[in-house]
Interface confidence: medium
């Protein structure tokens, strides 16, 4: 399965929307910085596109979940959030279409399950951090910047694999 060209464009637009969502400067939130331990190796270790697709799907699904909570709706601009959801939803559809076409439908390798679990744990750490920081504006800004970084890394690694095929 070949992901449509629009998937690549959607990734860039998602980053653009995340950038536009910024409300305060990260420099004013230095005391709130946190290393969430993004499992970058889980995207780099997959040697076939078939293996990256479920991991990338999990990543986007978790971003969707994170930004579609009540607390998130209160933190961000509604119009930008709606566009953000639309872009994420389209990317999830693209990835799901690939799974339906047979990519990753066969028995899931243990390595892939471990990778998906690593992504889930990463988002659990982000959710816990937000709770501990009582969903403060600085906490949300730290999370927004982190998601920009990790989403950019994961899509770049996935595109890198795609270009090698």
């Amino acid at each position: 399965c070949d992901l449509p060209q629009t998937h690549s464009l959607g990734s860039r637009r998602t980053l653009m929307l995340l950038a536009q969502m910024r409300k305060i400067s990260l420099f004013s939130c230095l005391k709130d910085r946190h290393d969430f331990g993004f499992p970058q190796e889980e995207f780099g270790n997959q040697f076939q596109k078939a293996e990256t697709i479920p991991v990338l799907h999990e990543m986007i699904q978790q971003i969707f979940n994170l930004f579609s909570t009540k607390d998130s709706s209160a933190a961000w601009d509604e119009t930008l959030l709606d566009k953000f959801y639309t872009e994420l939803y389209q990317q999830l559809n693209d990835l799901e279409a690939c799974v339906i076409q047979g990519v990753g439908v066969t028995e899931t390798p243990l390595m892939k399950e471990d990778s998906i679990l690593a992504v889930r744990k990463y988002f659990q750490r982000i959710t816990l951090y937000l709770k501990e920081k009582k969903y403060s504006p600085c906490a949300w800004e730290v999370v927004r910047a982190e998601i920009m970084r990790s989403f950019s890394l994961s899509t770049n690694l996935q595109e890198s694999l795609r270009s090698k095929e």
């Epitope: 629009t6 637009r13 950038a19 566009k83 890198s160």
Partner: antibody, heavy 119, light 108 residues
Framework: QVQLQQPGAELVKPGASVKLSCKAS????????MHWVKQRPGQGLEWIGE????????IYNENFKSKATLTVDKSSITAFMQLSSLTSEDSAVYFC????????????WGQGTLVTVSA | QIVLTQSPAIMSASPGEKVTLTCSAG???????LYWYQQKPGSSPKLWIY???NLASGVPARFSGSGSGTSYSLTISSMEAEDAASYFC?????????FGSGTKLEIK
């Protein structure tokens, strides 16, 4: 500051090929997609395609798929576009432009290379 | 592909006059991805307005942009000699990215 350097002109014969260059400076080359745009004399702009210098992935306008080939050389931080089987229709100015997000989208352009196809 | 039609193709305006250039899309364009570029003879295009209504760095405040769906416009509240140039609308809402045919704005 961000700069995209292109040679001023290329004179080529019909049926031949030409490889245009676009040397980048002032930013991290692999962080931004590079786009190519065609402009015929006194006419509008046509998007040819884009390449991600990080891993070489390309996306083309269907109208240029058999005409243009986009490549990059990371060591010389240069993007290239090869145009093949040239005809008079290919006589135009070709610009490279850097992609980006929001206000950075096509915010930086090369000066353009004038390609003249003539016997 | 999304065809962008600009009108008028050529227009003249006197200094101080209000000018409106239009860009009509063949199918709906997300306003976030509708841009305008200014180009002067012998030069490369310059980003002028991004995401329909945001002025690029260094663009005078007399310029403004508006629109949604299939209808967009660029307005100059008070024409000045330095505004004489060609203006192109551009969309990256969907592939292939397209540009309008341009409006050449001249000073009277």
């Amino acid at each position: 500051q961000v700069q995209l350097q292109q040679p001023g002109a290329e004179l080529v014969k019909p049926g031949a090929s030409v490889k245009l260059s676009c040397k980048a400076s002032g930013y991290t080359f692999t962080n931004y997609w590079m786009h190519w745009v065609k402009q015929r004399p006194g006419q509008g702009l046509e998007w040819i395609g884009e390449i991600n210098p990080s891993h070489g992935r390309t996306i083309y306008n269907e109208n240029f798929k058999s005409k243009a080939t986009l490549t990059v050389d990371k060591s010389s931080i240069t993007a290239f576009m090869q145009l093949s089987s040239l005809t008079s229709e290919d006589s135009a100015v070709y610009f490279c432009a850097r992609g980006g997000l929001g206000p950075a989208w096509f915010a930086y352009w090369g000066q353009g290379t004038l390609v003249t196809v003539s016997a | 592909q999304i065809v962008l039609t600009q009108s008028p193709a050529i227009m003249s305006a006197s200094p101080g006059e209000k000018v409106t250039l239009t860009c009509s899309a063949g199918s709906s364009v997300d306003s976030s991805y509708l841009y305008w570029y200014q180009q002067k003879p012998g030069s490369s295009p310059k980003l002028w307005i991004y995401s329909t209504s945001n002025l690029a760095s260094g663009v005078p405040a007399r310029f403004s942009g508006s629109g949604s769906g299939t209808s967009y416009s660029l307005t100059i509240s008070s024409m000045e000699a330095e505004d004489a140039a060609s203006y192109f609308c551009h969309q990256w809402s969907s592939y292939p990215f397209t540009f309008g045919s341009g409006t050449k704005l001249e000073i009277k």
